[in-house]
């Protein structure tokens, strides 16, 4: 018979004949022949192959490097890779999450507009007039200046975007 030029799904062409691909989780040991089937072997510990394949080596599971702020979200199997995610307090540098960085803190004079998530950084905003932040924080919003009037006190020192007002007693007229 005429040697094939194309093979069915889950097959590959070699030496003018169609051989079965190895299933996910297995690697190729030897091609099929006229008389024998394709020989495949399971991937070893910490290895995987996620497609029907003719690979002679399995891929190593991804290492979730703590130096890059990564931790294991889902352990790999012989058919799937390990999935990494960011440590608490870190966020991915891209959608694929190949590395993470610490959430940015908002400097004094700035407050947190939006708290960071695993995929997005802290969003800071400048404290408007009447509000302040005197700390560098990834959580603190701008705080309103203390209302001296409600405490029956007067402003002794004006507030800034980094400091609260300083209240003091009202000057009393001496008898």
């Amino acid at each position: 018979p005429e040697p094939p030029t194309a093979c069915r799904e889950k097959q590959y062409l070699i030496n003018s004949q169609c051989c079965s691909l190895c299933q996910p989780g297995q690697k190729l040991v030897s091609d099929c022949t006229e008389f024998t089937e394709t020989e495949c072997l399971p991937c070893g510990e910490s290895e995987f192959l996620d497609t029907w394949n003719r690979e002679t080596h399995c891929h190593q599971h991804k290492y979730c490097d703590p130096n890059l702020g990564l931790r294991v979200q889902q352990k790999g199997t012989s058919e799937t890779d390990t999935i990494c995610t960011c440590e608490e307090g870190w966020h991915c540098t891209s959608e694929a999450c190949e590395s993470c960085v610490l959430h940015r803190s908002c400097s004094p004079g700035f407050g947190v507009k939006q708290i960071a998530t695993g995929v997005s950084d802290t969003i800071c905003e400048p404290c408007p007039v009447g509000f302040f932040s005197n700390v560098s924080s990834a959580f603190e919003k701008c705080h309103p200046w203390t209302s001296c009037e409600t405490k029956d006190l007067v402003v002794q020192q004006a507030g800034t975007n980094k400091t609260d007002v300083v209240c003091g007693p009202q000057d009393r007229l001496r008898a």
Partner: antibody
Framework: EVTLKESGPVLVKPTETLTLTCTVS????????VSWIRQPPGKALEWLAG???????YYASWAKSRLTISRDTNLKQVVLTMTNMDPVDTATYYC??????????WGQGTLVTVSS | AFQLTQSPSSLSASVGDRVTITCQAS??????LAWYQQKPGKPPKLLIV???NLASGVPSRFSGSGSGTDFTLTISSLQPEDFATYYC??????????FGGGTKVEIK
């Protein structure tokens, strides 16, 4: 063993389009991204573009309009095209494993000369 | 546009010297900074990730520090094989994935 190998023309003419291919082995493009980085002779490294393991493409802002990065996960190849080549684009072009991250694995690089 | 400024661009030092290279980011990148060593005709080699963590197989004489916008690479006692060019790289986000201009460490 993880390997990355760049291939493409060694000489291109000004105004032509450069097409470079990075062929990888030892890892899956579904698990790791790949970036292209170049280095003009005697100059600094320049990050050009990256493609994430999820297929997301990223480009250096200064070269965005000239670059296209794509991949074929079955062929284990990542392709970079750069249009309107100029002599200042003469450089060694490297591919490295990783998208927006650090690059622990690099190809050996391919020198591309732009000259008429 | 985001920039990484490395200094000095070159330095001369002797074996045994303590060498310090700085890298300044034009905006905060948290600790999303890496350092590389490159020798002529070779691709760069990763030294430091996350601003201060030694990459696998890198000698302990190399150290990194810094966060935000200011970063430092230190070689505590320069060895003959350390004469090379060093680069910093930011990976905080796609818009700030950039290499510094390099620092060439030469023999005095």
């Amino acid at each position: 063993e993880v390997t990355l190998k760049e291939s493409g023309p060694v000489l291109v003419k000004p105004t032509e389009t450069l097409t470079l291919t990075c062929t990888v082995s030892g890892f899956s493009l579904s698990s790791y991204g790949v970036s292209w980085i170049r280095q003009p002779p005697g100059k600094a490294l320049e990050w050009l573009a990256g493609i994430g393991s999820d297929g997301s493409a990223y480009y250096a802002s200064w070269a965005k309009s000239r670059l296209t990065i794509s991949r074929d996960t079955n062929l284990k190849q990542v392709v970079l095209t750069m249009t309107n080549m100029d002599p200042v684009d003469t450089a060694t072009y490297y591919c490295a494993r990783g998208g927006i991250t650090v690059y622990a694995m690099w190809g050996q690089g391919t020198l591309v000369t732009v000259s008429s | 546009a985001f920039q990484l400024t490395q200094s000095p661009s070159s330095l001369s030092a002797s074996v045994g010297d303590r060498v310090t290279i700085t890298c300044q980011a034009s905006q905060s990148i948290s600790q999303g900074l890496a350092w590389y060593q490159q020798k002529p005709g070779k691709p760069p080699k990763l030294l430091i990730v996350g601003a201060s963590n030694l990459a696998s197989g890198v000698p302990s004489r190399f150290s990194g520090s810094g966060s935000g916008t200011d970063f430092t690479l230190t070689i505590s006692s320069l060895q003959p094989e350390d004469f090379a060019t060093y680069y910093c790289q930011s990976y905080f986000s796609s818009s700030s994935t950039v290499f510094g201009g390099g620092t060439k460490v030469e023999i005095k």
